[in-house]
Amino acid sequence: FNISGCSTKKLLWTYSTRSEEEFVLFCDLPEPQKSHFCHRNRLSPKQVPEHLPFMGSNDLSDVQWYQQPSNGDPLEDIRKSYPHIIQDKCTLHFLTPGVNNSGSYICRPKMIKSPYDVACCVKMILEVKPQTNASCEYSASHKQDLLLGSTGSISCPSLSCQSDAQSPAVTWYKNGKLLSVERSNRIVVDEVYDYHQGTYVCDYTQSDTVSSWTVRAVVQVRTIVGDTKLKPDILDPVEDTLEVELGKPLTISCKARFGFERVFNPVIKWYIKDSDLEWEVSVPEAKSIKSTLKDEIIERNIILEKVTQRDLRRKFVCFVQNSIGNTTQSVQLKEKRG
């Protein structure tokens, strides 16, 4: 289709080479009252109804995205050619940063409902650059945490080094929805609820003598509980003795509950005590078996190919640790009688 009638928007993505970050493009198709470029300008006034209702902002889940190759080749369907770009309704998600994402992206409705809708499309010229200087040492992260039940704030990474007074007007979106009243470089959240978790986008306009473009950053906001004040507790094994059959294989499971920590480095390991000696056992990797907002249950098994007489004289110890402290639970094997 002819893209010369598309409205054009220029966007800049300056990504940090130090962190993982995502980016999004919204299919900003015009609403009915802004639909002056959603129909062919060549039509005579007699042929053009006074109001040309475009498909309307409620129908934007069904749009098609293309990339325009720089060599002038035909438009490419995003879904077929770019695995690191995902379409979700009318939003295009870039999962990995890189200058190779620079280019022109076009979106238009899949269903052309009338001949006037043919040129109803938006062309987004995206320029992607790595952040060059570390002029702002403490710029806000693209991953921000909000503590449930307390007051918090969400900062626009590309503007977090500017004071509120010198900051330009910012446009914020939450999960693709415009937050019309939020206009500063920082959103204050009076009281944090689960509701506040999501993908936030902040845009501001930057201009030079030649043109202006939208600088965009994406912030993933997570709502969290406060760091635990407790050391982990061992849920299993509960008993300190275990009846076993000699010569048979045996798996002993250690399950421990770790309270939430923002910087989470759980330790769960097995070691063996034999008289005065003790050594750590090489066992399968630990696995998370349940994760909630407040805590996580992690399991790690010790596997004996067959229980020997020597194993009955040993203690098998599960050791778990977080930043607060550690807990141990030892198990003595006992031969089954009868």
Partner: antibody, heavy 121, light 111 residues
């Protein structure tokens, strides 16, 4: 008993100023409530004026028409909400209600009985 | 500011009638909408919050529905004590649950 009681309503000349108070009892201001002012002109509908968050952020929110002329504030130690009204006009004549907004629902679950402000020469 | 548009501005009905009042927000407010009832000389009383949750002590003949920009308050069988003025209100402001703009009100009068 949990209640809100407004005071300070009066007859004032156009261009004048007035400060309304709202005393809360039976609950603590420092809890996570939005304390707000709503007004109702004689025979007209409800009109939101302003809110202040009683928690730590102390954020304030105003209807666009109220910005600049009206100032909402609070004194947590006195459990009292205030509305400072400057450059008053005839169209500010109304019953001013104090109301409490609750948590994550944002609705007004507690209202005062209102205080009448009359702006007239 | 968000604008809330309520219709009709008044309606006349009889006891036992089913009454429907609509409210439209100027932008998407998800389900952050409350409905109030006000009688002459009294402060408003909360009926419904979060678009469809009945406030404590409110009779089940009152119900609310809708999300996004379009909302409805329904009284399934009008009772004599229901003749009053009803208001909708937006209860989200940006990302905060701040009670703010009201609709213009709907006066329910006896036919």
């Amino acid at each position: 008993e949990v209640q809100l009681e407004e005071s300070g309503g009066d007859l004032v000349q156009p261009g004048g100023s007035l400060r309304l108070s709202c005393a809360a009892s039976g609950f603590s201001f420092s809890s996570s409530y939005y304390m707000c002012w709503v007004r109702q002109a004689p025979g007209k509908g409800l009109e939101w004026v302003a809110c202040i968050y009683a928690g730590s952020s102390g954020s304030t929110y105003y209807a666009s028409w109220a910005k600049g002329r009206f100032t909402i504030s609070r004194d947590n130690s006195k459990n009292t909400l205030y509305l400072q009204m400057n450059s008053l006009r005839a169209e500010d004549t109304a019953v001013y209600f104090c109301a409490r907004g609750a948590g994550s629902n944002g609705d007004f679950n507690l209202w005062g009985q209102g205080t009448l402000v009359t702006v007239s020469s | 500011d968000i604008q809330m548009t309520q219709s009709p501005s008044s309606l006349s009905a009889s006891v036992g009638d089913r009454v429907t009042i609509t409210c439209q927000a100027s932008e998407d407010i998800e389900s952050y909408l409350a409905w109030y009832q006000q009688k002459p000389g009294q402060a408003p009383k909360l009926l419904i919050y979060r678009a469809s949750t009945l406030a404590s002590g409110v009779p089940s003949r009152f119900s609310g529905s809708g999300s996004g920009t379009d909302f409805t308050l329904t009284i399934s069988s009008l009772q004599p004590e229901d003749f009053a003025t009803y208001y909708c209100q937006c209860t989200i402001y940006g990302v905060n649950f701040v009670p703010n703009a009201f609709g213009g009100g709907t006066k329910v009068v006896i036919k």
